[in-house]
Amino acid sequence: ALDTNYCFRNLEENCCVRPLYIDFRQDLGWKWVHEPKGYYANFCSGPCPYLRSADTTHSTVLGLYNTLNPEASASPCCVPQDLEPLTILYYVGRTPKVEQLSNMVVKSCKCS
Amino acid sequence: ALDTNYCFRNLEENCCVRPLYIDFRQDLGWKWVHEPKGYYANFCSGPCPYLRSADTTHSTVLGLYNTLNPEASASPCCVPQDLEPLTILYYVGRTPKVEQLSNMVVKSCKCS
């Protein structure tokens, strides 16, 4: 699986999850998030050669098409597969609010 | 929606579904598919600016991050959203077989 366990431990050029730390205030301008100050959102990148963690029949077909037609612009793209939520703390006035934001952290990738 | 109805009628630079005809024999080397000889598989391409058909909270966050940090390599990617099956005819010996291949035709795209 192209997950953090594999990708963070290997120098993988092809599609894999990469570490990306996002600071809410600095990188997004979100001053309203009190905690955490930032988090590892991660991202997916790298080429998708034929059959690499293909998401659908279409991505398999497109991967093969791209292999046999290297000049073609059409190829599968490395995108998030499994995502996890992030719990944040913010304030409405002086009242603390806790909210779980879904699909905030990429744990694995696929070729789609 | 970034679907064929919209994308095929507009000159859209950003993420959209694009027409792509694939000939089974010529483009994939699949001589075993008797009918059809080829089909419009289509593909997704184009930049994913902030908020453009964002698939998850993560892609929204990544889009904003990319907007505020243009030098960053992390950005959402334009990938298939809705796919349709394709029915094919092939032969096992002299016996014709009809099979529906799932997720073969891209009908719309999203930024993931």
Epitope: D23, R25, Q26, K31, H34, P36, K37, Y39, L89, P96 | -
Partner: antibody, heavy 117, light 102 residues
């Protein structure tokens, strides 16, 4: 590499004020929170407050309300901690520490403040 | 303010052994916890952040676990140089309080 260099030891009388500096280098000073902490002799650690040098935003430990002032000079990458109305219980080692990813990852060497009559 | 309670107050072990220490938060802090090691005359050194992640340059003999209110720091293959005070600290809303140390 990240480096936080603090000012030297200070001795003050009760009721006086003390101002300690913390000069940062090796990272983007304006875009990381700076925490201030202290540790009394043979005691545990206590978080005092934090400042975001980029816009001067601060969060204080209510225990020090009115006595603690945190500032930052972005032209010299220096953070300052001023504590007023000192009492003997304020005798401690004072630390600045960079906030990163739910921790304080880099610390200054500490500045000893002694409050004695 | 969130109260952090560490146990035990002190701990002894032999070289090569495994030891564990605990930290309990008075309310849910999710995974927003760090562990530090402090040797006499030195400033604290970050060991673990976000409850389970090993800080740069820290031997993998150290590991953190837990989420919510209960957390554990484990030192396996204990070494003489591990003699120190260990503190937990939460990062879930200011003030960021520390445990009393082990």
């Amino acid at each position: 590499q990240v480096l936080l260099v603090q000012s030297g030891a200070e001795v003050r009388k009760p009721g006086a004020s003390v101002k300690i500096f913390c000069k940062a280098s090796g990272y983007s000073f304006t875009s990381s929170w700076m925490n201030w902490l202290r540790q009394a002799p043979e005691q545990g650690l206590e978080w005092m407050g934090q400042i975001y040098p980029g816009d001067g935003d601060t969060n204080y430990n209510g225990k020090f309300k009115g006595r603690l002032t945190l500032t930052a000079d972005t032209s010299t990458n220096t953070a300052y901690m001023e504590l007023s109305s000192l009492r003997s219980a304020d005798t401690a080692m004072y630390y600045c520490a960079r906030h990163y990813d739910g921790s304080t990852d880099y610390w200054g060497q500490g500045a000893l403040v002694t409050v004695s009559s | 303010a969130i109260t952090m309670t560490q146990s035990p107050g002190s701990l002894a072990g032999s070289p090569g052994q495994q030891v564990t220490m605990n930290c309990r938060a008075s309310e849910n802090i999710y995974s927003n916890l760090a562990w530090y090691q402090q040797k006499p005359g030195q400033h604290p050194k970050l060991l673990i952040y976000a409850a389970t992640n090993l800080a740069d340059g820290v031997p993998d003999r150290f590991s953190g676990s837990g989420s919510g209110t209960d957390f554990t720091l484990t030192i396996s293959n204990l070494q003489a140089e591990d003699v120190a005070s260990y503190y937990c600290q939460h990062f879930w809303g200011t003030p960021y309080t520390f445990g009393g140390g082990t």
